[in-house]
């Protein structure tokens, strides 16, 4: 017989990312005796929670809670028992809840006491459920994909561990209500709220981020719905071939469509809405998303918001991926150059219903968003951020990095859990568990 | 009422290629895609790649990517699948179905298939 | 890659309902299809879009799609169901049709 060493124990985590359109449970896992090693820790398991976000139980708080009851039952066979008591549990809500926050506080409090209730049944260590802001969800998301990535530091052969020379990945998310860019920059910002100073593994980041609300997939497509609904009588990225019953009040309950919506209407009203099939008006109407008429600073993305110009390689993810993917995928369409993108996005929006349906068997009504989508996509990189083709080429669109989802749920745990330290780490004795 | 009719069983050598048609009778496949679909003796159903005919579009698994090639003839309403490189694990039967736009192009109409069967 | 999850057998007393489910990652967001196939014969489709059925199927047959989780229910089970039951999805990630590996449902 021979000793055979056990391997270290593991440590759990979960976070519920409360997105506008769903909500996504992740759990989490590293060895219990390298919790301040770099890219320990990784995607145990996660679970879809069925039904809309928990901004969309605004009427029906104790829904919300209810609509989790699944995933969390999940998270009880995915943790082992013995580390239920041990595991944090977060809950971070995003964009759909801060809108809701904005137009109806009280509901957005009576969702989160609900979630809340539900959440502290559970054996799990709960840590509480918020609602973070913009700059955290890039932030963290920043973090994510950079610690994934191992771009903070890395362990050497020679028992060392030290910082790696390629710098950081710029991160950019598309989320359904809301989208950010954050990125690391050498200069100071201009506008102070755009800035974020981090310590990690006694390094000094400065990072510029911004998130802009009502930017995401979803709250863009309704502005984009109540456009066409204003100008055109008929939708200019809708295929050709498809027409659905519009329910007003749908379209104008969101703050992201106040300023488009009229004086008086009827909110039960129902509008017959078709698709025409038109790049070039699809593409104006999506640049009148995007204001540049005026910038206060020395420089400006949009809206009057400070940027500094994008440097370095970026992973854009979440709808950025998924709008990318599809182009690339389902429609085999090349979108390795800014160019590309904008040549997909015209096909794309070119194709009428039956051809649409024909390349893409099998999908939902959604299928007929992907023309806004894809132009919305090109028109916010290029214009929105100012990324030229040089800049573009440095950009990976990526959903999972090392296994894991890359997304903000991960560096907000790393970051609340101390799993990354501020300070470096000291020299460490590697034990091999093989 | 469209019928799918497929060419008949074949016998092929390990490294061969075998080509087998599908010809929609009593219909055209103005607005249908075709899709392949194999089943392994005692197996499940697996999905080899399509064709819209009227677009010149399609699209291969994986799994098959550079081994398989799906044609189609508009003016017979005929669809081919040839399979290449051929091994013993390629011993199946062989359905060729129709998509219909009506059911958002699933496989609304298959044929009895075609067995290959790949033998020294 | 995305993958559909399907209980090998299922067993029902002739007369009562019988369910088969389908898993995958967010299948509620995918629409569903099931066929049946009998032995020797070629699948047949007997429901489409998640709980549509086309013309000529009873109505016996029903489905469900929400979450992680899509379900064939076959309500009143004849002798004459007994068969191979698959459900499938179109994944976008991959531009494929994805079949699960088949419920053979028997009859008691």
């Known amino acids: 017989t021979r000793d055979v060493r056990e391997p270290p124990a593991l440590k759990y985590g979960i976070v519920l990312d409360a997105g506008s359109s769903h909500t996504s449970m992740f759990i989490y896992k590293w060895p219990a005796d390298k919790e301040n090693d770099t890219g320990i820790v990784g995607q145990h398991s996660s679970c879809d929670v069925p039904g809309g976000g928990i901004s969309s139980y605004a009427d029906n708080p104790s829904g919300a809670s209810q609509s989790l009851v699944g995933c969390l039952e999940q998270a009880l066979q995915d943790v082992p028992k013995e580390r239920h008591a041990g595991t944090p549990l977060y809950l971070g809500a995003t964009a759909g809840m801060r809108l809701l926050n904005l137009t109806n506080p009280e509901a957005s409090t009576s969702v989160l006491m609900a979630v809340t209730h539900t959440l502290t049944q559970y054996p799990f260590d709960f840590r509480g459920a918020r609602i973070l802001s913009g700059q955290e969800e890039g932030v963290f998301g920043w973090v994510t994909a950079n610690y994934l990535l191992e771009n903070f530091i890395k362990y050497g052969w020679v028992g060392r561990w030290f910082r790696p020379r390629k710098g950081t990945l710029g991160a950019m998310d598309l989320g359904g209500a809301s989208t950010q860019i954050t990125f690391e920059t050498t200069s100071p910002a201009e506008d102070r709220a755009s800035e974020v100073q981090l310590h990690l593994y006694g390094q000094h980041y400065r990072v510029y981020t911004h998130s802009f609300l009502c930017y995401g997939r979803d709250q863009v497509l309704q502005r984009l719905l109540a456009s066409a609904l204003q100008t055109h009588g008929f939708h200019p990225c809708w295929p050709r071939g498809f027409s659905t019953q519009v329910l007003l009040g749908d379209v104008y309950q969101s703050p992201c469509t106040m300023a488009q919506r009229p004086q008086n209407f009827n909110s039960s009203a129902r509008v017959s809405l078709s698709g025409s099939s038109d790049p070039h008006l699809c593409r104006d109407l999506v640049s009148g998303l995007f204001s540049f008429s005026s910038c206060p600073f020395s420089r400006c993305s949009f809206n009057g918001v400070f940027q500094p110009p994008v440097a370095g390689n970026f992973v854009a993810f979440s709808a950025f991926f998924y709008t990318v993917d599809f182009l690339r995928t389902s429609m085999g369409l090349p979108v390795a150059t800014l160019q590309q993108l904008e040549a997909a996005a015209v096909n794309v929006c070119n194709q009428t219903w039956a051809q649409l349906q024909a390349r893409v068997p099998g999908q939902r009504a959604r299928l007929a968003d992907y023309c806004a989508g894809a132009m919305f996509v090109q028109q916010l990189l290029s214009r929105g951020y100012g990324f030229d083709e040089r800049a573009f080429g440095g950009v990976i669109f990526q959903k999972k990095a090392a296994d894991t989802a890359v997304g903000w749920a991960l560096g907000y745990m790393l970051n609340l859990t101390n799993l990354i330290p501020a300070d470096p780490p000291g020299l460490r004795k590697g034990t091999d568990f093989s | 009422q469209v019928q799918l009719v497929q060419s008949g069983a074949e016998v092929k050598k390990p490294g061969s290629s075998v080509k087998v048609s599908c010809k929609a009778s009593g219909g055209t496949f103005d607005s249908y895609a075709v899709s392949w679909v194999r089943q392994a003796p005692g197996q499940g159903l697996e999905w080899m790649g399509r064709?819209?005919?009227?677009?010149?579009?399609?699209q291969y698994a994986q799994k098959f990517q550079g081994r398989v090639t799906i044609t189609a003839d508009e003016s017979t309403s005929t669809a081919y699948m040839e399979l290449s490189s051929l091994r013993s694990e390629d011993t199946a039967v062989y359905y060729c179905?129709?998509?219909?736009?009506?059911?958002?192009?699933?496989?609304?109409?298959w044929d009895q298939g075609t067995l290959v069967t790949v033998s020294s | 890659s995305y993958e559909l999850t399907q209980p090998l057998s299922v067993s029902v007393a002739l007369g009562q309902t019988a369910r088969i489910t389908c898993s995958g990652d967010a299948i509620g967001e995918k629409y569903v299809y099931w066929y049946q196939q009998k032995p020797g014969q070629a699948p047949v489709l007997v429901i489409y879009d998640d709980n549509n059925r086309p013309s000529g199927i009873p109505e016996r047959f029903s489905g469900s799609n929400s979450g992680n989780t899509a379900t064939l229910t076959i309500s009143r089970a004849q002798a004459g169901d007994e068969a191979d039951y698959y459900c499938?999805?179109?994944?976008?990630?991959?531009?494929?049709?994805?079949f699960g590996g088949g419920t053979k449902l028997t009859v008691l």
């Open positions: 179905a129709r998509e219909s736009p009506g059911y958002r192009y699933s496989f609304d109409v």
């Open positions: 499938a999805s179109y994944d976008l990630q991959q531009a494929r049709w994805v």
């Open positions: 064709i819209v005919p009227w677009l010149g579009h399609t």
